[in-house]
Amino acid sequence: SGRAANDPFTIVHGNTGKCIKPVYGWIVADDCDETEDKLWKWVSQHRLFHLHSQKCLGLDITKSVNELRMFSCDSSAMLWWKCEHHSLYGAARYRLALKDGHGTAISNASDVWKKGGSEESLCDQPYHEIYTRDGNSYGRPCEFPFLIDGTWHHDCILDEDHSGPWCATTLNYEYDRKWGICLKPENGCEDNWEKNEQFGSCYQFNTQTALSWKEAYVSCQNQGADLLSINSAAELTYLKEKEGIAKIFWIGLNQLYSARGWEWSDHKPLNFLNWDPDRPSAPTIGGSSCARMDAESGLWQSFSCEAQLPYVCRKPLNNTVELTDVWTYSDTRCDAGWLPNNGFCYLLVNESNSWDKAHAKCKAFSSDLISIHSLADVEVVVTKLHNEDIKEEVWIGLKNINIPTLFQWSDGTEVTLTYWDENEPNVPYNKTPNCVSYLGELGQWKVQSCEEKLKYVCKRKGEKLNDASSDKMCPPDEGWKRHGETCYKIYEDEVPFGTNCNLTITSRFEQEYLNDLMKKYDKSLRKYFWTGLRDVDSCGEYNWATVGGRRRAVTFSNWNFLEPASPGGCVAMSTGKSVGKWEVKDCRSFKALSICKKMSGPLGPEEASPKPDDPCPEGWQSFPASLSCYKVFHAERIVRKRNWEEAERFCQALGAHLSSFSHVDEIKEFLHFLTDQFSGQHWLWIGLNKRSPDLQGSWQWSDRTPVSTIIMPNEFQQDYDIRDCAAVKVFHRPWRRGWHFYDDREFIYLRPFACDTKLEWVCQIPKGRTPKT
């Protein structure tokens, strides 16, 4: 729409094309124009602020008639609003509606609301917190609107008393006097940034602040930057020698994504390391998933993500994104025995050798140990080289001989990607050389002693064959593109669900490939592409609709923020900023483009799973039809409650994870089973979390179970964005209905919490697997 995220907008009633405005505090409809009496803006705490009246839209649900009207923004009335697709709801899930030209709020209203001049819902460009520096608020975000001299300010203000645009960090500045300099996006590196040509970056040193890792990450992101990543010894030296820098501060290093290792939040490769031996990357049960840096020593320390610390942001001097075409298919010829793939040839050598011997052997084959530069390369390793024993460990060409650690490819190519396994890279202190292997199952990397004897993969350039109009083995008509053993084609007509075909997406690699296909739609109007994912029974459970009406379970998920939002829908992928992310749409009325898929071979079998009659290990329990065994750690059997991460690591130490669920019935049965375990009310951590910034606010299970059901209730919490971990409430004979998973015997609550809350927990292990002791 050409509009900046935080610009004022008109609110258009989709059904009538009218815009809403307040008159005498009540809401009415009028013809749309951009006069100030019709301009609104999202402000803090999910409120809608009207510029002209300087008031917030709210619901007074204390009255017998639920009054929709304008309130002072410091009112105790319910002022928050959220979107569900194109409808807008507030307290008690009352939805904004227009009736006879008058604004009202009722449950179940189906009114459609859009931002003026676009097809966007009101929440498509949500409010972004503006964090602060200097002042006296320790980096807390601006509170908009804030009150000064009887005027409500909905943006940062500039005056001669402050060094830059500033805001209050509480509602009433006159009373609290809390303020800070606004950290807003800026072109270049003028006001709040220090330029460093040598590293092609600008740095922002936020010293007088105290934010959690996630808040610091959001602050940097909202300025078009990222938390600091450190990519070389020279850069580390620059930071250590910097005057006035905080003694300890957050850096972008984290392992918040479930079942993945350490990574930089800006996705730079993690091949340069400087871990503090006292706070290493692979700690014990009490370990942490975020990293801070000690400015004096330059050492990195794993630390609790909820701690409040200063932080450093970094952004590149010039945003030149190198678009390497890693997913395009090219027919390749290789010697017998070698696997051809997109211009290279690969050989998995089944004899076990030390890293050096493996390297020498590859050299003897006029090749080198494999270097991996993209997810497309990882996919080759996982899907093509390991058909049988997927659990084997295999050498790759990554090696370190330096202190501080700097991993480099043996073939001399640049490190552009790292793909570390959980708690990796775990490098022994002051001990070199260090070599890297991957585990065939997921292709994730692990640091090993170079003397270990492992299988290895050699890689060399292959002979690229001439391009044809369509990729080899794909249908001859225009537009089919090959990926692995599958062909894909985009159909650009916008149609209802299921008109052209039902696309299934089975892995992260396939999703990345599809994202690449859809990238060219970034700049145009926001387009969507249908998948074959649908909730046929309207029970909130999504399955793949495949040929012949068969349903296939979800094996991978890639939901957008607050999705899946509603039952009974069909799923489309968005383009633009959140390319490939899944969103629930109306199957009949919504229209999207299609991507069709043809397998060159038959559809693979569904993965073998444990059987319900497999026994549970001693001390673990289960219930009929469950494929898992559970161990509950509640107040009657534990010394202390734990935060989410401590609980998850506790489970991992047992070879388990916090509980996960694929089906609505499963969680019901699980909670029936739990109510027999103890009395009273208990909140128990489960594996559901949205801790990783990569998730962009969507939920995931810590054991990699894909999300296929509507799990999180749309119950409003002011600080939902930082409630990143979920727990279930278990209790006997409750007195009121919960949000989800309702049946006669129990009422079940599932709720997001701040991850540092101390709760009880429940571990889960698949039936048939032996736990660690």
Partner: antibody, heavy 115, light 107 residues
Framework: QVQLVESGGGVVQPGRSLRLSCAAS????????MHWVRQAPGKGLEWVAV????????YYADSVKGRFTISRDNSKNTLYLQMNSLRAEDTAVYYC????????WGQGTLVTVSS | DIQMTQSPSSLSASVGDRVTITCRAS??????LAWYQQKPEKAPKSLIY???SLQSGVPSRFSGSGSGTDFTLTISSLQPEDFATYYC?????????FGQGTKLEIK
């Protein structure tokens, strides 16, 4: 308190005209839509017409379309119903009611169309 | 036009009884349904709006439920002043339409 008072009813011959008024008090008239609803003797309720708060939009029941006109004067806090080409079947008690939820009704005014 | 069908068209009940009147729309009307009480020679009085919201000043023994096409008005314990005719009305789309009415009489 909210009050709606209809007036202007009476006996009229078929084909003639009549203008009903509804005087509003106790609320901000200029921000509410208003309805006319009628009830024939011994029969149920029938919705007649609506006008938005600013007079910009008007809607009618098919049975009165082209014959009746709803209007308002926000400066006088008054709603009107101009009824032309009256028919015997228009005989009813006419009520005004406040939009959007029909929360307040007037006491009604009787219109009798008879020769 | 949307047709509104009320049932029953009349019913007899005693003071203290629990009474239910139903209303069915010929197509989905979301929650845009109102219930009115009318006594002889009086204007209708609004009881329920938006299917389930109680109008200000209406006793809590009156309640409404439903969404889409099927709606219910319930009087939990009949009082002498509740004997009257009850109408439902859809105001989802023009022209707004009423049910034919349910006459509630003393048994």
């Amino acid at each position: 308190q909210v009050q709606l008072v209809e007036s202007g009813g009476g006996v009229v011959q078929p084909g003639r005209s009549l203008r009903l008024s509804c005087a509003a008090s106790g609320f901000i008239f200029s921000i509410y839509g208003m309805h006319w609803v009628r009830q024939a003797p011994g029969k149920g309720l029938e919705w007649v017409a609506v006008i938005w708060y600013d007079g910009s939009n008007k809607y009618y029941a098919d049975s009165v379309k082209g014959r009746f006109t709803i209007s308002r004067d926000n400066s006088k806090n008054t709603l009107y119903l101009q009824m032309n080409s009256l028919r015997a079947e228009d005989t009813a008690v006419y009520y005004c009611a406040r939009a959007p939820h029909f929360d307040y009704w007037g006491q009604g005014t009787l219109v009798t169309v008879s020769s | 036009d949307i047709q509104m069908t009320q049932s029953p068209s009349s019913l007899s009940a005693s003071v203290g009884d629990r009474v239910t009147i139903t209303c069915r729309a010929s197509q989905g009307i979301s929650s845009w349904l109102a219930w009115y009480q009318q006594k002889p020679e009086k204007a209708p009085k609004s009881l329920i709006y938006a299917a389930s919201s109680l109008q200000s000043g209406v006793p809590s023994r009156f309640s409404g439920s439903g969404s889409g096409t099927d709606f219910t008005l319930t009087i939990s314990s009949l009082q002498p002043e509740d004997f009257a005719t009850y109408y439902c009305q859809q105001y989802n789309s023009y022209p707004y339409t009423f049910g034919q009415g349910t006459k509630l009489e003393i048994k």
